[in-house]
């Protein structure tokens, strides 16, 4: 709130802008007839120093010259970089109560001369873009510093533009707004940047370049692809480019891929043939351009073209399996299953499957199409049957896959030996076996088949299977394997016209069952007791049950109970025991055991046998 210098003036020597480390003399002078009334000798001039509007020092002790009551000179040293405000005030010493009156003020800026600008680089984006140059200004000067960018070319012209740096903005880039023309492609241009402030000036070294050095072409645009004769593997990529482009780089990849296919194309003129595409695959295509074969810069990548290649007829063969069930003495139900082709084999959207069942000798043929991956038919039990399946998309069908329908477990001599199932981790099971001992025909392949042992799984869920070559004796099964679930696993050995199988149960992880079996009835027959139960609900089994235990003891007895251990069979739900005394009341219960341990006991039932006991 200074009434601007009404009472006097403040001057700075050598200047209000000084280099770092220099001293300055500040003189404060009162105008004629200003000062303390009646007592000029009582005029006392004081100098206050402010940084960021905060009073930091009273320079009373820095007076170097004094004309009593008229002017004073103060020396200031050790000023920090940036701006410092000095305010001269008049203190009338005979009036202690009045505060000092502001006379005038001055700002002193401390800084450094600019360093020569370095690392100049210039770019023109596209043939019709404008030249923009950037540089490194060096150390901050703490002063307003003007920068002039000057560009001299081959046509006797010099272009220049200015900007400045201060404590609010930084100037290290300028767009000249000038467009260099391609007809000057080989010509040399010289650019330099000059920096000037109150403490000095400096100039960069001249930086020389050609049109080709600095022009970055615009990325190609209007990208499209034309598939020759609707081919899924060959296509012509087309795009628009700036006129001077001589080199293109193409990159393309399937959308789910992590690595690009790269192609360099010279003088492509906006067209390139690709021959190695995968049919019915989502691809991403991008293109970059360059104006010179050896020099210059690549453009940014174009926007992506995303498109799907056309379909081609399926290749590969379907993996088929089947189940046979006798319905009555002369009919059987055949259920065929097959796995979907993987995308590289399907080469399109599979519209349907062509299924054929053929009786070899009578030449009876059943044919159908289905959109599902299974098919069931009832056929006579007589005759030798063969099945074939092929997959069809909009472009055609795959070669049919044939399988002979044999009695899968009909030949005991073909049954694999020593089948075992070991849990490997949470979601897979290692199945191992030994080959059949006395097979009268060679094993052509093994099939490992598995399904969850849950109610209705045979009808509700298709089987899972793996084809194993005849010289392998193990399989790691993982598809649809979940922990705490028991699976029935069959290993089939197939020859040309026969099959043998062995079965085992297995799980990938197990716990003790949640509960024991529920005893539903105890009946007495011919001096034996029959215990009947219901199996533990499937979710509570928590793995493969190895055996059940039936416990009994006399009511109110504190002795250890007796027990009978029964090998678990899914079909069995009753068991006789014969060591109970007649006319003694017993308490009975059951538990179930997995590889992880025994369940809590199931319900308790009391029973008093009536007949003679052995």
């Amino acid at each position: 709130n200074i009434d601007v210098c009404k009472l006097g003036t403040v001057t700075v020597q050598p200047a209000p802008v000084i280099p770092l480390g220099s001293a300055a003399n500040i003189s404060c002078s009162l105008n004629p007839k200003q000062g303390c009334s009646h007592y000029p000798s009582s005029n006392e001039l004081i100098l206050l120093k402010f940084v960021n509007d905060v009073l930091v020092e009273n320079l009373h002790g820095k007076k170097v010259h004094d004309h009593t009551g008229h002017s004073s000179t103060f020396q200031v040293t050790n000023l920090s970089l940036g701006m410092t405000l000095f305010v001269c005030k008049l203190n009338c010493s005979n009036s202690q109560k009045k505060p000092p009156v502001p006379v005038c003020g001055v700002e002193i800026s401390v800084g450094v001369a600019p360093e020569p600008p370095q690392n100049i680089s210039c770019v023109q984006e596209g043939e019709n873009g404008t030249v923009a140059c950037s540089w490194n200004s060096g150390k901050v000067t703490y002063l307003k510093t003007n920068y002039t960018l000057q560009l001299s070319g081959p046509n006797n012209l010099t272009c220049q533009k200015q900007c400045f740096s201060d404590n609010r903005q930084n100037c290290n880039r300028l767009d000249l707004g000038i467009n260099l023309s391609p007809d000057l492609a080989e010509s040399r241009f010289i650019v330099r940047v000059t920096a000037i402030n109150d403490l000095g000036n400096s100039s960069s070294l001249p930086h020389t370049f050609t049109f080709l050095d600095i022009v970055i072409p615009l990325p190609p645009w209007d990208i499209r692809i034309n598939f020759l004769n609707a081919s899924g593997s060959r296509g012509t990529l087309q795009w628009e480019d700036e006129g001077q482009v001589v080199l293109n780089q193409l990159r393309y990849q399937p959308l789910n891929s992590t690595s690009w296919n790269m192609v360099n194309a010279t003088n492509a003129k906006g067209k390139y043939d690709l021959r190695d595409l995968r049919p019915f695959t989502e691809y991403e295509f991008q293109i970059s351009s360059k104006l010179h074969l050896s020099g210059g810069s690549w453009s940014n990548w174009s926007e992506s073209l995303r498109t799907r290649t056309p379909e081609e007829e399926p290749v590969g063969i379907l993996d088929i399996w089947y189940m046979k069930q006798d319905i009555d003495y002369d009919r059987q139900q055949i259920s065929l299953f097959w796995k979907s082709l993987n995308p590289s084999e399907a080469r399109g959207k599979i519209l349907h499957y062509q299924v054929t069942l053929q009786e070899v000798t009578k030449k009876t043929t059943l044919q159908n199409t289905t959109r599902h991956t299974s098919w069931t038919r009832v056929i006579p039990r007589t005759g030798a049957w063969t099945a074939s399946v092929s997959a069809a998309n909009s472009k055609g069908a795959s070669a049919p896959t044939h399988i002979n329908i044999v009695d899968l477990c009909g030949t005991g001599l073909l049954a694999p030996h020593q089948v075992s199932a070991k849990s490997e981790n949470m979601d897979n099971i290692l199945v191992t076996w030994q080959p059949p001992k006395k097979a009268d025909s060679a094993v052509r392949e093994y099939i490992v088949e598995w399904r969850a042992l849950q109610p209705g799984s045979i009808t509700k869920f298709p089987p899972h299977w793996l084809r194993i070559p005849p010289d392998n004796m193990s399989a790691l099964i993982s598809e649809n394997i979940k922990p705490y679930i028991c699976y029935e696993i069959r290993v089939h050995a197939l020859s040309e016209s026969q099959g043998g199988c062995s079965s085992i149960r297995g799980d990938s992880k197990h716990k003790a069952p949640v509960s024991g079996p529920h005893i539903t009835a105890i009946t007495e027959k011919k001096e034996r007791l029959f215990i009947s139960w219901t199996h533990i609900p499937f979710p509570e089994q928590r793995g493969c049950i190895l055996h059940y235990r039936i416990y009994w003891k006399e009511r109110d007895s504190t002795a250890q109970p007796e027990l009978c251990e029964i090998q678990y069979r899914r079909s069995q739900n009753s068991h006789p025991i014969s060591s109970l005394q007649p006319r003694v009341t017993y308490v009975l219960w059951m538990t179930a055991v997995t590889a992880a341990g025994e369940s809590p006991q199931g319900n308790e039932r009391e029973f008093c046998p009536q007949g003679k006991a052995n």
Partner: nanobody, 127 residues
Framework: QVQLQESGGGLVQAGGSLRLSCAAS????????MGWFRQTPGKEREFVAA???????VYANSVKDRFTISRDNAKNTFYLQMHSLKLEDTAVYYC?????????????????????WGQGTQVTVSS
């Protein structure tokens, strides 16, 4: 109708200074490139300096570091400050206005790219 009017020419001694002005009327030229050309008898018009609408200054190498072009958009006026004048700077000086504000480097120096012209002002440098 668009008019450009030059002023400030005259007789000056070698080494002296002059400031030419170009006042535009009929349309604003704040988004245009403005140029100064000069012509001596029997010769084609020669490019002297131009200022683009983004304030880039363009100079013929023969006047670089001696002449300064500037603009005052509020007054729709353009200036050419000339220092260290030489005998060969004697000519009629013309102010020219560009319709589009083109940025191609070869455009600034070509008189055919400027559709608007003033009547000219004589500058004579004597020894």
């Amino acid at each position: 109708q668009v008019q450009l009017q030059e002023s400030g020419g005259g007789l000056v001694q070698a080494g002296g200074s002059l400031r030419l002005s170009c006042a535009a009327s009929g349309r604003t030229f704040s988004k245009s490139t403005m140029g100064w050309f000069r012509q001596t008898p029997g010769k084609e018009r020669e490019f002297v300096a131009a200022i683009t609408w983004t304030d880039t200054e363009v100079y013929a190498n023969s006047v670089k570091d001696r002449f300064t072009i500037s603009r005052d958009n509020a007054k729709n006026t353009f200036y050419l400050q000339m220092h260290s004048l030489k005998l060969e700077d004697t000519a009629v000086y013309y102010c020219a206005g560009d319709r589009y504000g083109s940025s191609r480097d070869s455009v600034f120096s070509s008189p055919t790219n400027y559709p608007y012209w003033g009547q000219g002002t004589q500058v004579t440098v004597s020894s």
